[in-house]
């Protein structure tokens, strides 16, 4: 006869490990007892259990409550046992010693591998600002046994670097993602992907990128100067900019206070029916936590009568 076992038994932390030991004997052969021991404990073998054909399973005090026989139906030639709720410390070498009649004794050895799935964590780097050089966007750490694989999934252009720390029974892997911040990256997902044999599927943690910036400011509304004449209603100036975080707007007049009746509504400056009082230099001040920008325009309110007189003069002058 011969013993059938596995070279390696792999389980995930917390699962039950079946340690196989089956005697494939000739007809009439019997298994008297099967002794299971851990054999890499350093100070000699450590008994797990003794499986006796007459007296059943006797679990060693060191493994009390943790070793069972597989559920029925049971073959009398099967010396396999279940190690319940495998922990990392169970990883190691085990052997079964089988005493048979009349063929004598047999032994087999196997390695129990306990996979410890990682619990990844993602830590964003310092605040990203446009104009910075290569900057840490995020780091992702995962510890497990064996060492997990940590990669990044993103459309953003960047560079990655990884380092690994080995502990007694596990390894921690940290991967960093560096990039040169630009406003186009805003709102883009940066996903840490952790792979491990103890996971049914990859674990993914997504971080949304936020890059602080403030665009140049410009003012719209003066494209057609002829519309800015006395009496015109609904005239307005709009300050154009964009930023992250979203900017706030402030309007001032360079050559004095804002005329009465002029309404400030965020990025928009609304005028009452125009008078010559509204002529002047207006400044839009845009700011966020990152920066501030100014844009100024000159409003020149035209008097239609003066304009027509001038035109006549111009005509007569010609």
């Amino acid at each position: 006869g011969e013993l059938e076992t596995s070279d390696v038994v792999t389980v995930v932390l917390g699962q039950d490990a079946k340690l196989p030991c089956f005697y494939r004997g000739d007809s009439g052969e019997q298994v008297g007892q099967v002794a299971w021991a851990r054999v890499d404990a350093g100070e000699g073998a450590q008994e797990l259990a003794l499986l006796h054909s007459k007296y059943g399973l006797h679990v060693s005090p060191a493994y009390e409550g943790r070793v069972e026989q597989p559920p029925p139906p049971r073959n009398p030639l099967d010396g396999s046992v279940l190690l319940r709720n495998a922990v990392q410390a169970d990883e190691g070498e085990y052997e079964c010693r089988v005493s048979t009649f009349p063929a004598g004794s047999f032994q087999a050895r196997l390695r129990l591998r306990v996979l410890v799935p990682p619990l990844p964590s993602l830590n964003p780097g310092p605040a990203l600002e446009e104009g910075q050089g290569l900057t840490l966007a995020a780091s992702c750490t995962a510890e497990g046994s064996p060492a997990p694989s940590v990669t990044w999934d993103t459309e953003v252009k960047g560079t990655t670097s990884s380092r690994s720390f080995k502990h007694s029974r596990s390894a921690a892997v940290t991967s960093e993602f560096h990039l040169v911040p630009s406003r186009s990256m805003n709102g883009q997902p940066l996903t840490c992907v952790v792979s491990h044999p103890g996971l049914l599927q990859d674990q993914r943690i997504t971080h949304i990128l936020h890059v602080s910036f403030l665009a140049e400011a410009s003012v719209r509304g003066l494209e057609d100067q002829n519309l800015w004449h006395i009496g015109r209603e609904g005239a307005m100036l709009k300050c154009l900019s964009e930023g992250q975080p979203p900017p706030s707007y402030n309007w001032t007049r360079l050559d004095g206070p804002l005329p009465s009746g002029v309404r400030v509504d965020g990025d928009t400056l609304g005028f009452p029916p125009l008078t010559t009082e509204h002529s002047g230099i207006y400044v839009c001040h845009v700011s966020n936590e990152f920066s501030s920008r100014d844009s100024q325009v000159t409003v020149d309110v035209l008097d239609p009568q003066e304009d027509s007189g001038k035109q006549v003069d111009l005509v007569s002058a010609s």
Partner: antibody, heavy 120, light 111 residues
């Protein structure tokens, strides 16, 4: 310090029973099997059996299956061996013994021995 | 049951010389990991004392003049150099299977 303190010598009549005790101290009582070994005068050693202090489960040498009963009292960290239907063949020194590490093999710690004399 | 046969039954050795005791098992007690054979010393009126475990591993506190070797079915206990206090009976014991058994013993005396 691991100590196994056995009860004193016993003189018993043939056909009677005797119960030997082995008080354990200095270690986790439930973490190790307690073994019992017989040594007849001028003879070698014979392994009688072992008991698991966690649950009282015992394994015997078939030769002693009907002779010895192994029990434990967890509260007093004491192991007992009762010998029944005694004959002169049972006159011997009986030892309790413990393994070096939880579940490992060999007997690193021994009681001082209890002499049982069976005589009419 | 596994039978352990020790030889010689008794042995007289001069101080400082080597004492060699053999133990033969009726079947192999060795795996790829360990040999499940142990050696004990017993002095009159005392319990046995573990000297060597797993064929060759010296038990803590045991003098280095004691050594064990062997595998499979043949095992040896060596004492060198022998000292006066080594006068005792020596036993081998296997823990391959239940029942554990002991050899018949070897009585060591000084010449």
């Amino acid at each position: 310090e691991v100590q196994l303190q056995q009860s004193g010598p016993d003189l018993v009549k043939p056909g009677a029973s005797v119960k030997i005790s082995c008080k354990a101290s200095g270690y986790s009582f439930t973490g190790h099997y307690m073994h019992w070994v017989k040594q007849s005068h001028g003879k070698s050693l014979e392994w009688i059996g072992r008991v698991n202090p966690n649950n009282g489960g015992s394994s015997y040498n078939q030769k002693f299956k009907d002779k010895a009963i192994l029990t434990v009292d967890k509260s007093s960290t004491t192991a007992y061996m009762e010998l029944r239907s005694l004959t002169s063949e049972d006159s011997a020194v009986y030892y309790c013994a413990r393994d070096p590490l939880g579940g490992s093999y060999g007997f690193a710690y021994w009681g001082q021995g209890t002499l049982v004399t069976v005589s009419a | 049951d596994i039978v352990l046969t020790q030889s010689p039954a008794s042995l007289a050795v001069s101080l400082g010389q080597r004492a060699t005791i053999s133990c033969r098992a009726s079947q192999s007690v060795t795996t790829s990991s360990y040999s499940y054979m142990h050696w004990y010393q017993q002095k009159p009126g005392q319990p046995p004392k573990l000297l060597i475990k797993y064929a060759s591993n010296l038990e803590s506190g045991v003098p280095a003049r004691f050594s064990g070797s062997g595998s499979g079915t043949d095992f040896t206990l060596n004492i060198h150099p022998v000292e006066e206090e080594d006068t005792a009976t020596y036993y081998c014991q296997h823990s391959w299977e239940i029942p554990y058994t002991f050899g018949g013993g070897t009585k060591l005396e000084m010449k």
